[in-house]
Interface confidence: low
């Protein structure tokens, strides 16, 4: 018969107040003959947790039938866990002796500690929108977890980020801990549909990390590009001029037409379309009444996007009998 080993497979057992804890212990040999007892702590002050033969242990039950022939599983369950139950538990084999049993071998011990799950991570983005190519910061917070060991990762559209700083508080002993992490993310022009994800992994989550998300659409402003063009065909005394506002986000946009510096109040036709990347295009048509005797007309399309400074583009219509090519230039 091989030498007896006392196997306690768990080094650490995380338990929740009020729940039941299972402490595993198996032996590799039936010899020597004698009982297996459970203790908390070591040395003369150790506390007896379970003795099958004698004593009253109302919160302790065995996993296996200890009376079963050749039983080698001495695992126990402790119900209604309280903070007072934390400590290291040992299953100990005694050799039958006279007048009393003699301690023969102890398992390596299982540390029982109170575990608490982290709260769902909350991700907060910047207070104001920023344009592409700039860096914005996102914070992630999760609270109330124990033990202190925790892993936090950041992702942008599934790609792991590396530019972040994380703190776990407090640094000393505590019943519960909090984590706060700040990630720096460079915005790309196509990030309207992008997400940043904060992922928290903790031993209490049993391999299923918690995730918090933020949409970059809340943090990005994609400024528009403007183009003003004159339609080649004239219809009587009217010329159709188009202002195309491309690739902007968010949707908030004001467009005004000016004719020779005078803001035009009349209605104009327009359409709004959404691009695949989440940005928008706005097209506005303006009909200009012209006559051959009239002075040259300078049309200006002015766009105010998301409360920013207005940008404009102008088009000079040279109104002659033989209408010349249009020309377009930009104004700040």
């Amino acid at each position: 018969e091989e030498e007896l080993q006392m196997i306690q497979p768990e080094k650490l057992l995380l338990v929740t107040v009020g729940k039941t804890a299972t402490l595993h212990c198996t032996v590799t040999s039936l010899l020597p003959v004698g009982p297996v007892l459970w203790f908390r702590g070591v040395g003369p002050g150790r506390e007896l947790i379970y003795n099958q033969k004698e004593g009253h242990f109302p919160r302790v039950t065995t996993v296996s039938d200890l009376t079963k022939r050749n039983n080698m599983d001495f695992s126990i369950r402790i119900s209604s866990i309280t903070p007072a139950d934390v400590g290291t538990y040992y299953c100990v084999k005694f050799r039958k002796g006279s007048p009393e049993n003699v301690e023969f071998k102890s398992g390596p011990g299982t540390e029982m500690a109170l575990g608490a799950k982290p709260s769902a991570p909350v991700v907060l983005g910047p207070a104001a929108r920023t344009t592409p190519e700039h860096t914005v910061s996102f914070t992630c917070e999760s609270h109330g977890f124990s033990p202190r060991d925790i892993t936090l990762k950041w992702f942008k559209n599934g790609n792991e980020l590396s530019d972040f700083q994380t703190n776990v508080d407090p640094t000393g002993q505590s019943v519960a801990y909090s984590i706060r992490s700040t990630a720096r993310v460079v915005l790309d022009p196509w990030d309207v549909r992008s997400q940043v994800i904060c992922e928290v992994a903790h031993v209490t989550l049993q391999g299923d990390p918690l995730r918090g998300t933020a949409n970059l659409s809340e943090a990005i402003r994609v400024p528009p590009t403007l183009e003003v063009t004159q339609q080649p065909m004239r219809v009587g005394n009217q010329v159709n001029v188009t202002c195309q506002v491309r690739k902007f986000y968010p949707q908030s946009l004001q467009l005004t037409w000016s004719e020779n510096g005078n803001v035009c109040q009349r209605e104009t036709a327009s359409t709004l379309t959404e691009n695949k990347d989440g940005t928008y295009n706005w097209t506005s048509w303006f009909l200009v009444n012209i006559s051959d005797q009239r002075d040259d007309v300078v049309l200006t399309c002015q766009v105010k996007h998301d409360g920013q400074l207005a940008v404009s583009k102008r088009l000079a219509l040279e109104v002659t009998v033989h209408q010349k090519d249009q020309s377009s230039d930009a104004t700040p």
Epitope: Q5, P9, E10, K11, L12, T28, D149, V203, Q206
Partner: antibody, heavy 114, light 108 residues
Framework: EVQLVESGGGVVRPGGSLRLSCAAS????????MSWVRQAPGKGLEWVSG????????GYADSVKGRFTISRDNAKNSLYLQMNSLRAEDTAVYYC???????WGQGTLVTVSR | SSELTQDPAVSVALGQTVRITCQGD??????ASWYQQKPGQAPVLVIY???NRPSGIPDRFSGSSSGNTASLTITGAQAEDEADYYC???????????FGGGTKLTVL
């Protein structure tokens, strides 16, 4: 002598079924949890399924959950693995092992091929 | 489920000491077991629990554990120790078992 002997392997088409058996001897079978572990050709070991001493608790790897069923018959000192909806990626040597994997069988080869 | 990570290959000079490591979150809570497998053979358990050796395993094999890392140490490696070594443990949920990818040990 402590021994585990697997049987039931063979060649089967994708979508087919096989039942593996493991005959235990030389130890008190119903004192131990048991596992099935597999090893694809040239690859590492992969735990497939486990069962406690009386069959009251079972566990499965995600890759086989819903397709494989582990069971045991303590009166016959036998462990079983019923494998349904077999796929090419299930091709492997299947080992029967005592839960802590202190004792292993020699394995039985399962080949899933058209 | 959890993962256990091992170095794919490690080499050691004959008679020297080598350490093979296994990392994973589940090892904070569970001890690893270690297996030796030679070509064409079934695996053999060499270390289990805190540092237990089955009978017949030479005492040059030992195990240790710290945080999320388990280690198998061979003190005075012999030619016959050349093999693949696998670690395993229960996963973080405690309901499943997970194996490391294996480490090929070459004795030079």
């Amino acid at each position: 002598e402590v021994q585990l002997v697997e049987s039931g392997g063979g060649v089967v088409r994708p979508g087919g079924s096989l039942r593996l058996s493991c005959a235990a001897s030389g130890f008190t079978f119903d004192d131990y949890g048991m596992s099935w572990v597999r090893q694809a050709p040239g690859k590492g070991l992969e735990w497939v399924s486990g069962i406690n001493w009386n069959g009251g608790s079972t566990g499965y790897a995600d890759s086989v959950k819903g397709r494989f069923t582990i069971s045991r018959d303590n009166a016959k000192n036998s462990l079983y693995l019923q494998m349904n909806s077999l796929r090419a990626e299930d091709t492997a040597v299947y080992y029967c092992a005592r839960w802590i994997a202190k004792v292993w069988g020699q394995g039985t080869l399962v080949t899933v091929s058209r | 489920s959890s993962e256990l990570t091992q170095d794919p290959a490690v080499s050691v000079a004959l008679g020297q000491t080598v350490r093979i490591t296994c990392q994973g979150d589940s090892l904070r809570s569970y001890y690893a077991s270690w297996y030796q497998q030679k070509p064409g053979q079934a695996p053999v358990l060499v270390i289990y629990g805190k540092n237990n050796r089955p009978s017949g395993i030479p005492d040059r094999f030992s195990g240790s554990s710290s945080g999320n890392t388990a280690s198998l140490t061979i003190t005075g490696a012999q030619a016959e120790d050349e093999a693949d070594y696998y670690c395993n443990s229960r996963d973080s949920s405690g309901n499943h078992v997970v194996f490391g990818g294996g480490t090929k040990l070459t004795v030079l």
